[in-house]
Amino acid sequence: FERTRSLQDPCSNCPAGTFCDNNRNQICSPCPPNSFSSAGGQRTCDICRQCKGVFRTRKECSSTSNAECDCTPGFHCLGAGCSMCEQDCKQGQELTKKGCKDCCFGTFNDQKRGICRPWTNCSLDGKSVLVNGTKERDVVCGPSPADLSPGASSVTPPAPAREPGHSPQ
């Protein structure tokens, strides 16, 4: 089939980095500057992605592959192929309409991205709190209270609400 197709369609012989130029009797022409074709047989070359603003160039465009972007410091990539950049926050914070805000009591965020999420409720698994949670770290659950040897005690902080709320603006 491929052989038949190449006999019928001269464009199928054009390799990556070229395009089948209809204006020049279907000759394989190199992609113009700032464009590429990553597969053979293409009738046009695609425009190279430009990494501008909060995007920076991770890999330059070539005649056979698109440019790749990442984000400038203080931002992180979102989307397939880093199609978006979003502002970083500090650990223990989340991004809101008013910028980076500290996690509310009973919630934490151990990354510079994402949202504050509730501490693990150790008692749901029949365990006790071994290490208290903070804005940056989840609680650490230990053995169940019944498993503790006599005289031993576990840290018992105020239990966060089952569904921690957020303080008003």
Partner: antibody, heavy 117, light 108 residues
């Protein structure tokens, strides 16, 4: 770049358990993202089912929580959905998606699951 | 009853401007994300954050918000913009997600 692909056994009978898997390619499921399931009944809107982190931590839609289990297999770079005691109302296109700060930035193409006897 | 409310349908003449709204308490604190979905296809993110577009999304799509209402505006609507549009944000818990009911945009 990251791509997601849902797969499952096809039609499910009422009262049985629906099982779907989402394969992650072009990136690691152990990245700093959460991995979600979203469904869409025919002709209706999107409904978030739940999500999982590579550590196994999960959050579920309260309306489905009693029937949903989401699990992760980091060695296979995939995560799975189980929905028990299904009825015709669970007939939907099921999507897996990557979630980051509430933004579903990468989606699978979706798979239709029909619940019918 | 969704925690994010959208009008079910709007229509717009080709080349004109259309505005879709999304209301919900969580939008006082957090931005909505907006998704476009065409028949038989998966949703595609078109706006996130205050007014940010993923690369490849035309600049005729923009967002704004006021209080508990987020808006998506298509300025100079094209035939290919005919689709369902969904807003999304957090639910009351603050750490789970919810979608609006969707708005069907018809380009006349």
């Amino acid at each position: 770049q990251v791509q997601l692909q849902e797969s499952g056994p096809g039609p499910v009978k009422p009262s049985e358990t629906l099982s779907l898997t989402c394969a992650v390619s072009g990136g690691s499921i152990s990245s700093s993202h959460w991995w979600s399931w979203v469904r869409q009944p025919p002709g209706k809107g999107l409904e978030w089912i739940g999500e999982i982190y590579h550590s196994g931590r999960t959050y579920y839609n309260p309306s489905l929580k009693s029937r949903v289990t989401i699990s992760v297999d980091t060695s296979r770079n995939q995560f799975s959905l189980k929905l028990s005691s299904v009825t015709a109302a669970d007939t939907a296109v099921y999507y897996c998606a990557r979630e980051d700060g509430g933004i579903m930035d990468v989606w699978g193409q979706g798979t239709l699951v029909t619940v019918s006897s | 009853s969704s925690e994010l409310t959208q009008d079910p349908a709007v229509s717009v003449a080709l080349g004109q401007t259309v505005r879709i709204t999304c209301q919900g308490d969580s939008l006082r604190r957090f931005y909505a994300s907006w998704y476009q979905q065409k028949p038989g296809q998966a949703p595609v993110l078109v706006i996130y954050g205050k007014n940010n577009r993923p690369s490849g999304i035309p600049d005729r799509f923009s967002a704004s918000d006021s209080g508990n209402t987020a808006s998506l505006t298509i300025t100079g609507a094209q035939a290919e913009d005919e689709a369902d549009y969904y807003c999304s944000s957090r639910d009351r818990s603050g750490y789970r997600w919810v979608f609006g009911g969707g708005t069907k945009v018809t380009v006349l």
